[in-house]
Each structure stands twice: as C-alpha cells, then as structure tokens.
C-alpha cells in the first residue's frame, strides 16, 4: 500500500549560470501542525532514464503545507543534454534506516535546455564560467548538424572529449591554471565550414586568507585595522573582493571599503574586549581571520607636540612637550635621544601622564643639538609613535682654550718684524663666534712699555715691527662672553737659528717621521714648523705644538707634493716661552728625478781644455737631493782618458762620462783636448733617483796652439 | 547573412550626449560578446567597451567609464552605447563588434560621430 | 596599460613578396594577441586569434606566431587585394588595446 505521505507536484527549473537543478515539491496529507522527519530519494539522470547519474537521500523535518526545496549543481553544463528527474520518500526513522518503507516513485521529470537554444549551427558551453584554479571543468558542444566533424581548442591547442550523443560531445579539464585576466579562451570550430564559437572560462587565483591582521588605536575613538589581502585573484574586474569586519562581543558587523584596512567606531560604553573576524570574500570562497585582544593593549600613541626648551644654558637645557590625552589617563613611557652633531649622544626614558619634562645636561656652549621624543603605553607596550624633533641651541661661554700661536721673524735694517699666526678655535674651545683676538706687546725691559692691538675675526695672523729687543707678546680670542685663556710668546731680537746644521729625512706617503733629541733643563714643550707650500712667497706656514717628553713625531700633510723640499725646524720653547731653534730637517715626502740641467758657463777656453761652470743652480730647489753631476763629452777620436769613461747614450752615441762627487762643486775642467778639435759637453745633475734630462750638447772647438788666449 | 548595423551617429556639442544602437542579425545574438570599437579620422583602432551574453558584466576604458554605458537587449538583437559628456576627442566612427571571446569576428560599417561647437 | 608598438608604420613592397609586420608588447601578454585587415573605406577584418591561429575563411598566404611579448604577422605573397593597414590587438589584459597600424602597399 502506497505511503500516505508522498512528494508531489515535483517542480524542476533550472539556473543555467550556476548549472544548477532547483527542485520544489510539497507532500500532502500532513496535517497542518504535524511535524514528520523524512528522508526523499532523488534520483537524477542524463540523456535517458535508465542512465542514472546521482542518487542522493535528502533527510528534512516536514510540515503540513510547506514547499520544500533541494538544488543539485551539475558538472555538465545543463545545456549539453537532457536530465530526468523522480523521487520518493519515506518516513525518516533514523533506528531502523534498513527497514524503510518506500513511496512510489514520482514520474520523471524532464529538463531540456536545449530547447530554448537559438537557431545556431554551434553552441558551446558554459558561458562565463567562474572557477578557481586548480578545478575540474565539463565543457561541451552542442552542434545542430550531425554530419558536422567539430574539433574544439583550449588555447589554441586541440581538446580530446568524448560524445554524450551525436550532436553533443564534453570535454573536462583538470587542475585548470590561471593565464590571464581576460579568461582561458576555448574556441570550438567546424572542420569544413565557417562556423566558430568562442567562450571564455575565467580561472580565478585563489582567494588567500588575509594575513598580518591587526587593530589599533590612536584616540580611543577608532580602532584602525590592517591586514595584508595576499596576491589578487587576477579577476579583479569579474570576482570583486570584499572585506568584513565583525565583533562579536557587540553583535556588530563593517563592510571595509578598502583591500587592506578599515576603520572600526570604537563603543562610547567603554567596550575594552573586542573579538573580530576579517572575512575576504568572492563569489567563490570565503576566508576568515580572527583577533581577540584588549583595547588598551592595542595603543598606538599619537606623536608628541608642543616640544618646547626652556631655562637653555651654558651646558643644560629643560626640555618639555605635551602628549595627547587617550582619556583613560594611563601614564605613558617617552623615549627621548639627544644628537649632537648627526649621532645620539644622549637617551632618556620619562614616565609620562600629561606633560613631560627631562633636564639635559652636559651639554657644550653655542652648540646646535637636536632633540627627539616618542611616546608608547608604559603597562602594555604596543607602539612607539612618531618621533616629534626639534631644535635648540646653548648659550655662548667665553672661549676656553688660549688659541695655539706661532711667530716668523725677520730682521729688517735693524728692526724685527714678527708676523704672528694663530689657529682659529675649535667649535668646543670657541663656545661662540669669535669676534677678534687681542695682541698685548710686553716690552720685558720695560714691563711699563705695553701696546694693544685688536686684529678682528676671522684673521689668522698679525705684523709687528719690534726694535731687538725682548718681547713677550699675549694673544686672546674673544666672543660675546668673555676673553679665552692667553697664549703667551717670547720674541728676542736674535733667534741664534743659523748655527744649527740641517739633517736629511726621507718621507713616505705617511708623510715625514721627525726625531729630535731630548732637552735637558725646564721645557715647557716642542714645536715643529714647516711650510707646507714652501715655494710659493707666502709658504703657508705650519706648526705642530707637542709635549715636553715628546722626541718624535710624524708630520702628514695634504699638501705635501713628490719633488717638492720640505724644510722642518724643531724649536723647544724654555718655561720662560722663549722658543730657540734646536734641530732643522729638510726631505721630499717622494725623491723624483732632476727636472733641469745647470745652465753652464764655458770659460779659459785652450787648445787642450776649457772650464765648466754652473754657479747659480740652486741644489735646494730641485726635485731630490743632488748627489753630483755628470759631465758628458763627446769627441770624433771617441777616446776616454783617465778620469772618465765610456758612455752610451739613448740615442746610440757614444761619449765620455766624468762623474763628480759633490754636489757644492761646481766648476770643472775639461782638459787632455786636441787643438784644433770639435767637442760637444752636456752637464747633468744626478741624485738617489736618477739623472737630469740629456738635453741638447753644447759645441765647442778648441784653437790651434798657437792662438792667443 | 551575418549582419551588424550601427546608428545614431550625429553632429553633437561638446557636453551633450548620444545614443548609438546596433541591431544584429543572421546569427543569435544572446551567444555572443558584444563590443564598440571606435576609430578617430585618420587615427588607429580603440577600444571602448564590452558586454557579455546577459549584459551582468561590462567592461570599459578606463577614462570612458564615467561617462560611457554599454547595454544590451537581447529581445530586440540590439546593443547600445549611452555616450554623455561628449568631448571633441570622442569624435570617431564608432564600430559595433561582436566577440569571438575579446577577439572580434564581426564588424558593422560603423556610425560616425563628431563633437564640435 | 598594455602598449602594443608596431613596426613598421608603412611598407611598400611588390608583388608576391614577402611582408612581416612586427608587434611588440610592453608587458608578456602570453598568446592573446589577434590581427586585422582593414582595407580603405572599410571595418575592419579579423585575420588572426590567439596569435597564430587563423580564422575561418581566411587565405592561408595569412599567417602568425609569437608568444611572451614579441609577435609577428607574415603574408607569404603579396596580393594587389592586400593593400590595408594591418592591426595587431591584446586581450590578455584589461584594457583591451591595438598596435598603431601598418600600412601595406604595392610598389
């Protein structure tokens, strides 16, 4: 007997765009409060009836009058070929699921797309089909001609499928991958023919789970979250994205208008728990996220403002700056950094609540310092803020450092004139702009005899014409504040420099290593003085201040050049200030080869010699150090005689070499001629590392015997 | 014989707005990507806009989309183009295009339309 | 957006010779690239989809090739009906864009 409550009036339609199969039936005979748990037997199948293709129990609880509802989405499109639908039902009766007892079968139901298609001789199928990557796809033709040969392209590349009936074949392809934004194109065409249909299957990249969630706030006003999206789908256009915020304590839920973050009100009620899930979501997928956190965990402090300095001294400086109230009046911990100069010198931590105040100290005078401060929760440290910066600059103090001084003395028709130079003051020794520096002349056979001169910055030397006497000669720097300690020195009519001899160093591209011997008696300390431009009128004199047990140093320089002398001279300066020349020593910082030969005078001209001079070439001035000169002579006879030998010269000629050995001689005498003879000679000086250019020779012919002198 | 025919092409001010419609035939046009393309005098081809099957999605150039609208009425075999805020650059004979997918295998004679005070 | 520059703007060539118009596009544009006719006074054709794939009906002198982003057009023998200016277009992203043209003709 046939089961009193069977499915009837079975509805099918259908969603093509989805591929789905939407059944709508009701059972009748239920009572209208009766509640009854049934299980419905679907059966689908394709092409004909016997070719069942799904069977699926549906287990739901019925009540009287209620349309019930179940959807089947198809692998196949729906278009590609008829679906036949039934079902039956029984009483769900979950004990005993064995002993069902069956209704009939409702009679088919059948479902014919095909139907509704147009008058084309080719269909393709599914139109706009949105998968994700990594899917299994059906496609299929439909063709209105049986005598058609249909091949059908996946990019181009010809897809192997099987034929459902003579006018309809399918296709599947597997872990279909992402190419482009525009779609898969597929293409299915008539052999012999002109027919062609074109679908584009859009393969989404999947959706990825937003990562780096995370709120917070700044005011207490508004949480902020951000989250990083992950890569995009690559169907932005076709699969639009969409980001929810909900929190589950207050029940309340934001669409994000933006991919990667979104604001979120925080309650007036003083909510401090809060439990968000971030959904990212498309047509295709979900995904979600969730944080649970406490709000005043979560603080991002605004930047600090109103940085201010005040009570800004010689050395300290009170710094204050206001933070911004959350409300809560929770105390903050201000991180504050001192830079001088472009570096931290100084870090501070400050307990903060509203205002904050920090005392820097050991600071220099007239100094440009910058100072920076942050703030972050002191309980429950989240973030730092923005640093906020500002500037500031000490107060000027009198220079404290005497400027470090040197003299050149001259004697002038009776006079000395000592020119005074001074180093300008560091930045730290300045403590402020120098202005001028005072020169105070003591006259010490008269202390009462006292000049004042003021030399006004930035001037870096004096002349003083002094008769020969004794002087003791004071030079301050001054700034806005005050007056530096004095740098003190005694000038004497008679420096006494000339009886010291001068010794020879080598440098080396460190430059010159300079020793001295150490003074017996009360020193006060050493100078070494150079010039480092030594050939030009000014020189550009310098000078090395160095300790009293000091008997060595190296002095470099950027100026030093290959082939220029340097001449250095060490002074010990008595406690008395007098500075009396100890050592001179003269070297190349690179010895080069002599750049020109001695112009030579000839003279005493016989019919057996002549004599060579070159009185005014000046040793000193040459490129390294002259050890002597060569004397090259050349002859027809080509003979070398005692006292000479035989050269060979760069272009192959051959001559005689005399060779001297002291550079101070400078005379020589070419003797053992024959009258009546042509000579040529060639004078050149050598040193440690070669020899002057071999120029031109110069001609001479010696007279008979018998002519006069 | 497969067939697209475009009209509605016009002397318009700049600022002003047109209509152009397209009416298919000879094939079903509710299978198929429809397009406009448009060509200004003496220039090369542009893009302006496509409709799927159903008209559920279209897609523009960019600096069209605020002021063009593509639309489709399956029923009538008709595919329009709403143009508003006509400038002198829109000036072109605009094609109505049917799609094989994005390519395009069916072109109509084309409309012209000139935006000039 | 994605540029399609083709080369060169203009060629004359005799009879029966060889023509290749180049296509180079600014970003990879895999093989959605098609080719098209348009001969004066006329809508365009389309000759040529997914780069290398001819379409119904059209000549086989008409050929494609190419990948990534350099593409190429190839008509074997130049025919007096062949006079046009020839299009390449991408599809591979939005917006949908055309090279500038090439004009054929017969010296």
């Known amino acids: 007997e046939p089961l009193p409550w069977a499915p009837e009036s079975l509805k099918v339609s259908i969603n093509s765009t989805h591929q789905c199969l939407h059944l709508q039936w009701s059972v009748h005979n239920l009572a209208y409060h009766q509640e009854l748990k049934m299980v419905f037997q679907i059966e689908i199948s394709r092409i004909k009836t016997s070719n069942v293709i799904w069977v699926e129990n549906y287990s739901t609880t019925v009540k009287g009058n209620q349309l019930l509802h179940w959807s089947w989405e198809s692998q196949l499109p729906l278009e590609c070929a008829k679906h036949f639908i039934r079902m039956r039902s029984a009483v769900d009766d979950a004990t005993t699921p064995e002993q069902r007892f069956w209704s009939n079968w409702s009679s088919w139901e059948e479902v014919d797309v095909q139907n509704s298609l147009g008058h084309e001789p080719l269909f393709v199928f599914p139109k706009d089909k949105l998968v994700e990557e990594g899917s299994n796809v059906t496609i299929c033709y439909v063709s209105r001609s049986q005598q058609n040969n249909i091949s059908c392209y996946l990019e181009g590349v010809r897809m192997q499928g099987q034929q459902l009936d003579p006018n309809v074949s399918m296709f599947n392809l597997h872990n279909v991958a992402f190419i482009r934004e525009t779609g898969t194109n597929i293409y299915c065409k008539v052999d012999r023919g002109d027919d062609i249909k074109g679908i584009v299957l859009f393969v989404s990249k999947i959706l990825e789970e937003p990562k780096d969630f995370s709120c917070e706030t700044r005011d207490f006003q508004t949480l902020s979250c951000t989250w990083d999206p992950g890569r995009d789908t690559g169907l932005l256009k076709q699969l639009p994205q969409s980001y929810t915020l909900f929190e589950s304590f207050s029940g309340k839920k934001t669409l994000c208008k933006h991919k990667g973050w979104c604001n979120w009100q925080v309650a007036p009620e003083s909510q401090e728990m809060y439990n968000f899930t971030l959904t990212a979501e498309n047509y295709l997928r979900k995904r979600s996220v969730h944080i649970l956190f406490n709000l005043t965990h979560r603080v991002h402090p605004m930047a600090p403002f109103n940085v201010l300095f005040k009570d800004v001294s010689v050395t300290n400086a009170t710094m204050t700056w206001k933070v911004h109230s959350t409300g809560n009046y929770y105390t903050l911990l201000c991180q504050v950094e001192l830079y001088g100069e472009g570096k931290v010198i100084q870090k501070h931590n400050v307990s903060v609540k509203v205002n904050g105040e920090l005392v820097l100290s050991g600071l220099e005078p007239d100094t440009e310092y910058s100072a920076q401060v942050r703030c972050a929760n002191a309980n429950h440290f989240w973030k730092w803020s923005e640093w906020t910066r500002q500037n500031f600059t000490t107060v000027e103090a009198a220079p404290s450092e005497a400027p470090d001084v040197w003299r050149n003395v001259k004697s002038v028709q009776g006079y000395c004139v000592v020119t005074l130079f001074w180093k300008p003051l560091s930045r730290l020794q300045a403590n402020g702009e120098i202005l001028f520096y005072n020169i105070v002349v003591e006259d010490l056979d008269r202390p009462s005899g006292l000049q004042l001169l003021s030399v006004p910055a930035p001037a870096n030397r004096t002349e003083l014409t002094l008769d020969q006497r004794a002087y003791q000669i004071h030079v301050t720097a001054n700034n806005s504040v005050g007056t530096s300690p004095a740098s003190v020195l005694v000038v004497s009519g008679d420096p006494g420099d000339e009886e010291v001899e001068e010794e020879r160093v080598k440098g080396t591209e460190d430059g010159f290593s300079l020793s001295w011997k150490p003074q017996p008696g009360n020193i006060t300390g050493y100078i070494v003085e150079w010039c480092d431009r030594p050939r030009d009128p000014l020189c550009d004199l310098q000078w090395k201040h160095l300790g009293p047990n000091t008997t060595s140093t190296v002095i470099s320089s950027d100026a030093f050049r290959p082939g220029v002398r340097y001449n250095f001279r060490i002074y010990g300066i008595s406690t008395e200030m007098v500075p009396y020349l100890l050592e001179k020593k003269t070297g190349y910082s690179q010895e080069l080869a002599p750049s020109d030969n001695p112009r030579v005078v000839m003279s005493n001209l016989t019919s057996h010699s002549f004599t060579l001079s070159w009185k005014d070439y000046s040793t000193e001035s040459q490129p390294s150090f002259i050890r002597g000169y060569h004397v090259y002579l050349k002859s027809k006879a080509g003979q070398c005689h005692p006292g000479s030998e035989k050269a060979v010269l760069s272009d192959d000629s051959v001559c005689c070499k005399y060779k001297i050995d002291d550079p101070k001689q400078k005379m020589f005498v070419v003797g053992n001629l024959q009258p009546e003879s042509f000579y040529e000679f060639l004078v050149t000086p050598y040193s440690a590392v070669g020899e002057g250019p071999h120029g031109a020779f110069t001609k001479v012919t010696t007279p008979d015997e018998y002519s006069p002198m | 014989e497969v067939q697209l025919v475009e009209s509605g092409g016009d002397l318009v001010k700049p600022g002003g707005s047109l209509r152009l419609s397209c009416v298919a035939s000879g094939f079903t046009f509710s299978d198929y990507y429809m397009a406009w393309v448009r060509q200004a005098p003496g220039k090369g081809l542009q893009w302006v806009a496509n409709?799927?099957?159903?008209?559920?999605?279209?897609y523009y150039l960019d600096s069209l989309k605020s002021r063009f609208t593509i639309s489709r009425d399956n029923a009538k075999n008709t595919l329009y183009l709403q143009m508003n805020s006509l400038r002198a650059e829109d000036t072109a004979m605009y094609y109505c295009?049917?799609?094989?997918?994005?390519?395009?295998?069916?072109w109509g004679q084309g409309t012209l339309v000139t935006v000039s005070s | 957006e994605i540029v399609m520059t083709q080369s060169p703007a203009s060629l004359s060539l005799s009879q029966e010779e060889k023509v290749t118009i180049t296509c180079k596009a600014s970003q990879d544009v895999d093989t959605a690239v098609a080719w098209y006719q348009q001969k004066p006074g006329q809508a365009p054709k389309l000759l040529i989809y997914?780069?290398?794939t001819r379409h119904t009906g059209v000549p086989s002198r008409f050929s494609g090739s190419g990948s990534g982003t350099d593409f190429s057009f190839t008509i074997s023998s130049l025919e007096p009906e062949d006079v046009a200016v020839y299009y390449c277009?991408?599809?591979?992203?939005?917006?949908?864009?055309f090279g500038q043209g090439t004009k054929v003709e017969i010296k």
């Open positions: 409709i799927n099957y159903d008209g559920s999605s279209t």
């Open positions: 277009q991408q599809y591979s992203r939005f917006p949908l864009t």
């Open positions: 295009v049917r799609g094989l997918t994005w390519d395009f295998d069916v």
């Open positions: 997914l780069a290398s």
